[in-house]
């Protein structure tokens, strides 16, 4: 007996589609072996029509696919545009058609119900709009027009040209009679309900000379689209509900165990707290379509999601909806990375951001999630070097360690930096991840002077003190610019014996600028790292002034946190619209910061440290 299981009998009608789900024991071998759908011929051979390796027969081209869900031990065969010729005996199976594990499926495609001659068929999703066309002859132009619904042997009046409207259709139906010369009237029914399904009769005039036309209205519940995403990754629900509801409030909800639908997010400002920090509702296009992005996917996010439109911002019968069934794959290609990173006021954090390693050339971004209204995520930094003005001197995006991970360093932390941040690229949108920064009690581990004023032409020495736990880490100084932080050349770091007992007096790494030039003004970072993995950093601003003359005043350099607040949509801002979430900027407002000058160059800058070991462990 084969352990593969599925539906023995599948029946459908011409023009429709089927979604055949086959179940298999999810052993490691089964999960990764070939899956197939084949048709049994008279000879007994089973000819492959579609397989998990990408094969699609010419007969199925453009209308069928096979999707494997390895974690659930299922695969789904979708076949659209069915015809009577598709009726027959099939197998869904694993391995090789002739001797693999398989299950027999019988597919029967029928013509559909017998309808009166000349019946027009209208197939529409629930909540949408249908326009029924009713032709008539010239002699019936002045006569009463009407639409009836056939219920059994009786006909129930739905609407007529004498202003009658059946109560079941109140406020959602209208009969339009065109100007002279056009021999057709139309009946428009909005916000279709399942109960509207059935056979209708258009009538113009009365008696034996009347015009009649049959219309078969099929109202369908929308098929949920199967969406299969990786744990920790991101999903985008694209919702296009039509122009009719372009100006109506939109929502995304999740169907619960009571079969009601809990709002996840809507355009009226409601948001489920379970999605805090990891959801955005994209601004609507002119056609009323919108999309919702959820990052940091969890197993408990699985379920049936509906998007829709209604003035209350929640699901109501008879309004258009779209449906998805979300599966979250625990065998994720997205590596684990901390979802919470903690830092202390005045200290720093180094955030590791995963990206699709096949897209090493993609642009990398980091944005700050803001929950107001539908959510937005203004970009703070990108790999091309643009940094928001108020983060000048304290934020950098590094390509290291590479191979699927980049690093974002934020220092000079304040309590205002607490919040949710998104890592993203201009490539694979499923690799968007969320990290929460929390500011906790404590002191920074690296100590540098608050502000330093250097004198032109003289020598400047800036100390950076570090605790014993960093004695084996690599220490560095770098000069910050909005394109990164350029490491300054190191000098001989002295004898290692001084660090065997972690001598109190020897725990410092110094930066020397000799001689000081105008180009040396700017932000400098002292940091620790292990290989390509960055730990803590501390920032110091160096102001450069002329030699003091009697009566001159000391000018304190601008501190990073004194930068002006971000202004929304002022002259220096460009509003970036996110078209179908292809643009990773996520409707950010960003400011472009001018480069902060040349890097400190050559032998003028040197780093001196009495440490010679590199430390293991993490500074986070």
């Amino acid at each position: 007996k084969s352990p593969v299981f599925g539906p023995q009998e599948v029946s459908s009608v011409e023009g429709n589609s089927v979604s055949i789900k086959c179940y298999y024991p999810p052993t490691s071998v089964n999960r990764h072996t070939r899956k197939y759908w084949c048709r049994k011929g008279a000879s007994g051979r089973c000819i492959t029509l579609v397989s998990s390796e990408g094969y699609v027969s010419s007969n199925y081209a453009g209308r069928a696919n096979l999707t494997n869900f390895p974690e659930n031990g299922t695969f789904v065969v979708n076949i659209a545009q069915l015809s009577r010729d598709d009726s027959g005996h099939y197998k869904c199976g694993l391995g090789i058609n002739s001797r693999g594990l398989s299950f027999d499926v019988s597919l029967e495609v029928s013509q559909g119900p017998e309808l009166p001659n000349g019946t027009e068929v209208y197939t529409v999703d629930v909540g949408r709009t249908v326009t029924i066309k009713c032709p008539f002859k010239t002699e019936n132009a002045p006569k009463t027009k009407a639409l009836y619904k056939k219920i059994g042997q009786t006909s129930v009046l739905v609407i007529d040209s004498r202003n009658y409207v059946n109560p079941n259709y109140k406020d959602r139906i209208r009969l339009r009679i065109p100007g002279t010369g056009q021999l057709i009237f139309t009946v428009v029914i909005d916000r279709l309900r399942l109960s509207d399904h059935g056979l209708y009769l258009c009538q113009a005039g009365d008696g034996s000379n009347r015009d009649e036309k049959n219309a078969d209205l099929q109202v369908l519940e929308p098929e949920p689209e199967l969406v299969y995403e990786d744990l920790r990754g991101s999903v985008t629900f694209h919702c296009a509900l039509g122009l009719e509801v372009a100006n109506v409030a939109k929502f995304l909800c999740r169907v619960n165990s009571r079969e009601t639908c809990d709002v996840v997010i809507n355009t009226l400002g409601k948001r489920d707290s379970a999605f805090e920090g990891r959801i955005l509702l994209n601004p609507q296009d002119k056609d009323g379509s919108f999309s919702v992005v959820i990052t940091g996917l969890r197993k408990e996010d699985e379920g049936r999601y509906l998007c829709g439109a209604h003035s209350d911002g929640q699901l109501q019968e008879g309004w258009p909806i779209q449906a998805w069934q979300l599966f979250v794959n625990e065998e994720s290609t997205i590596p684990r990375s901390p979802t919470v990173v903690k830092g202390v006021a005045g200290g720093s954090v180094a955030v590791l951001c995963p990206y699709n390693p096949k897209e090493s050339q993609s642009l990398k971004y980091w944005c700050l999630w803001e929950g107001a209204q539908n959510g937005r995520c203004p970009l703070l930094v990108e790999s091309q070097g643009l940094v928001q003005e108020q983060y000048e001197g304290r934020l950098s995006l590094l390509q290291e360690p590479g191979n699927g991970t980049f690093t974002v360093i934020l220092n000079q932390l304040t309590t205002q930096d607490a919040g949710f941040y998104w890592c993203l690229t201009n490539g694979d949108t499923r690799w968007r991840t969320t990290v929460e920064i929390k500011i906790i009690e404590g002191e920074p581990n690296l100590k540098v002077p608050g502000n330093v004023t250097a004198v032109l032409g003289e020598t400047l020495n800036i100390p950076c003190h570090f605790p014993c736990k960093f004695s084996s880490y690599e220490k560095y100084w770098c000069k910050w610019s909005n394109t990164g932080c350029q490491t300054l050349p190191s000098q001989d770091e002295g004898p290692s014996e001084a660090f065997v007992n972690c001598d109190e007096n020897s725990r410092l790494v110094s930066l020397t600028l000799n001689p000081v030039t105008r180009a040396d003004e700017g932000w400098y970072w002292c940091g620790v790292k292990q290989g390509h993995f960055y730990g803590e950093t501390a920032a110091v601003y160096v102001a450069v002034e002329e030699k003091k003359v009697a009566g001159s005043r000391y000018v304190s350099p601008a501190k990073a946190d004194a930068a002006p607040d971000e202004k929304v949509l002022d002259s220096g801002v460009r509003e970036i619209e996110n078209k179908a979430i292809q643009d990773p900027r996520l409707f950010a407002e960003e400011k472009v910061v001018a480069d902060t000058g040349d890097q400190a160059g050559g032998s003028r800058a040197s780093v001196d440290s009495s440490s010679s070991e590199e430390q293991g462990g993490s500074s986070k």
Partner: nanobody
Framework: EVQLVESGGGVVQAEDSLRLSCAAS????????MGWFRQAPGKEREFVAA??????????YYADSVKGRFTVSGDNAKKTLDLQMKDLKPEDTAVYYC??????????????????WGQGTQVTVSS
């Protein structure tokens, strides 16, 4: 409140036929899957047959032990389910339960794939 009510159970002779019916009320959505399970004395509840609806397509599932003898049918709009049983055997003796679920995900053979259950109807097949 959701209610599934089975009917049609009884005592029959081996090789006879019997038709079970199930009527659902209070289901908030039109159900997308309904199924039959059975439980014989001292045994675990086992899958018998199921029917799923999606759009204008219907999917029927059967346990190997009843394939060719039992036929499942139903009406999604009316929320009814039937099980036509032919060529009954003494080993078919059990309490038959009707089950329903609003969507059609999850293996239809597992009881966890259903949210609502009836009280059951007894079928006894004597030799």
């Amino acid at each position: 409140e959701v209610q599934l009510v089975e009917s049609g159970g009884g005592v029959v002779q081996a090789e006879d036929s019997l038709r079970l019916s199930c009527a659902a009320s209070g289901l908030p959505f039109s159900s997308s899957r309904m199924g039959w399970f059975r439980q014989a004395p001292g045994k675990e509840r086992e899958f018998v047959a199921a029917i799923g609806w999606s759009g204008r397509s219907t999917y029927k599932y059967y346990a190997d032990s009843v394939k060719g003898r039992f036929t499942v049918s139903g009406d999604n709009a009316k929320k009814t389910l039937d099980l036509q049983m032919k060529d009954l055997k003494p080993e078919d003796t059990a309490v038959y339960y009707c089950a329903a679920h609003p969507d059609y995900y999850g293996d239809p053979r597992t009881s966890g794939a259903y949210r609502y259950w009836g009280q059951g109807t007894q079928v006894t097949v004597s030799s």
